[in-house]
Interface confidence: low
């Protein structure tokens, strides 16, 4: 990946909009298509004020762990969807787009150096375990995807890119 492409806000915005389109196509979280089993996903909640005061290395750990779990979750959803009778074409398309998007974002973050922090996180003994929740519909899964990109990922890349510019 070209160096620091993730620092161009339009790149991340494209993936966020794709994620929101996927959420919209699933017809709402109450009545939309359900997953045949619950899938573990990262909790996207972010305490803005606490996050803002975290070291960028600590943010990187949370982002990387969340991205890994999210990738596993969407791959799991793809497998469940493949085993279902008559999977809707549009849903399949958005799952494929999400998988492709997460792979691209993972590559872009590697260039930014986020995975280095996971290998040797600061104060590893004190690092809080990643909070998780479960998704039982495709809508909830895509909402978590969208919220993760708009939340922790966007906040982290904004700060990491600012640091890199100094």
């Amino acid at each position: 990946a070209p160096p620091r492409l993730i620092c161009d806000s339009r790149v991340l915005e494209r993936y966020i909009l794709e994620a929101k389109e996927a959420e919209n196509v699933t017809m709402g979280c109450a009545e939309g298509p359900r997953l045949s089993e619950n899938i573990t996903v990262p909790d996207t909640k972010v305490n803005f004020y606490a996050w803002k005061r975290m070291k960028v290395e600590e943010q990187a750990v949370e982002v990387w762990q969340g991205l890994s779990l999210l990738s596993e979750a969407i791959l799991q959803a793809q497998a469940l969807q493949a085993n279902s009778s008559q999977p809707p074409e549009s849903l399949q398309l958005h799952i494929d787009k999400a998988i492709s998007g997460l792979r691209s974002l993972t590559s872009l973050l590697r260039v930014l150096g986020a995975q280095k922090e996971l290998m040797s996180p600061p104060d590893a003994t004190q690092a809080a375990p990643l909070r998780t929740l479960t998704a039982d519909t495709f809508c909830k899964l895509f909402r978590v995807y969208s919220n993760f990109l708009r939340g922790k990922l966007k906040l982290y890349t904004g700060e990491a890119c600012r640091r890199g510019d100094r």
Epitope: S9, L12, E13, I16, L17, K20, T44, K45, V46, N47, F48, Y49, A50, K52, R53, N147, R150, G151, K152, K154, L155, G158
Partner: antibody, heavy 127, light 108 residues
Framework: QVQLQQSGPGLVKPSQTLSLTCAIS??????????WNWIRQSPSRGLEWLGV?????????DYAVSVKSRITINPDTSKNQFSLQLNSVTPEDTAVYYC?????????????????WGRGTLVTVSS | SYVLTQPPSVSVAPGKTARITCSGD??????VEWYQQKPGQAPVLVIY???DRPSGIPERFSGSNSGNTATLTISRVEAGDEADYYC??????????FGGGTKLTVLG
């Protein structure tokens, strides 16, 4: 139920300092889960967020770019209130000033939602 | 600086659906809130995080946000819904941005 009670003068002379206070009941100004904001509203500028103060092991603040050089928001833990000071005011600063509480911890965005507001204080800047 | 644009006014008949829009560059990538303000009163939060309702806000109020536009939808409009409505978003680290406001008039 959180309540915010505002007080301060309604008339300030140009070049002087605008000072307002917001007394909190139902919560603590030094709560680790809340943030305390000032927002103003005028016909010419609409609603305008001015700044925030919050406590997370120590005190932090953030101010709007438009007033950064003139604004100070301070806590008063003994009285459970917080104050706004805006220096070197001009008639452009004439507005209804509101204090408001926001709560962090939801999906990103929720911490900015102003769920509780004071009633507002009309401040006129005039000689 | 970031700008949120709202129509100055929207009119709707009682019982019908009102839609108030808020547009900004790539607004769908930010979170949007909506506030209702009646004359002489402080604003009241009716929607946060694009589409969530605080407790006490009727289900008739809903929100969405995609692309460049966020929309506040009020179904089965009542006379008591007549007010000014403001969208807001935190588009940067420190600044909250409010839209210019939309006056909702309930006809009849």
């Amino acid at each position: 139920q959180v309540q915010l009670q505002q007080s301060g003068p309604g008339l300030v002379k140009p070049s002087q300092t605008l000072s307002l206070t917001c007394a909190i009941s139902g919560d603590s100004v030094s709560s680790n889960t809340a943030a305390w904001n000032w927002i103003r509203q005028s016909p010419s500028r609409g609603l305008e967020w001015l700044g925030v103060i919050y406590y997370r092991s120590k005190w932090y603040n953030d101010y709007a770019v438009s007033v950064k050089s003139r604004i100070t928001i301070n806590p008063d833990t003994s009285k459970n209130q917080f104050s706004l000071q805006l220096n070197s005011v001009t008639p452009e600063d004439t507005a209804v000033y509101y204090c408001a509480r926001s709560v962090p911890g939801g999906d990103p965005g929720l911490e900015h939602a102003f769920a509780y507001w004071g009633r507002g204080t009309l401040v006129t800047v005039s000689s | 600086s970031y700008v949120l644009t709202q129509p100055p006014s929207v009119s709707v008949a009682p019982g019908k659906t009102a839609r108030i829009t808020c547009s900004g560059d790539n607004l769908g990538t930010y979170y949007v809130e909506w506030y209702q303000q009646k004359p002489g009163q402080a604003p009241v939060l009716v929607i946060y995080d694009d589409s969530d309702r605080p407790s006490g806000i009727p289900e008739r109020f809903s929100g969405s946000n995609s692309g460049n536009t966020a929309t506040l939808t009020i179904s089965r409009v009542e006379a008591g819904d007549e007010a000014d409505y403001y969208c807001a978003s935190f588009a940067s680290w420190s600044d909250s941005v409010f839209g210019g406001g939309t006056k909702l008039t309930v006809l009849g």
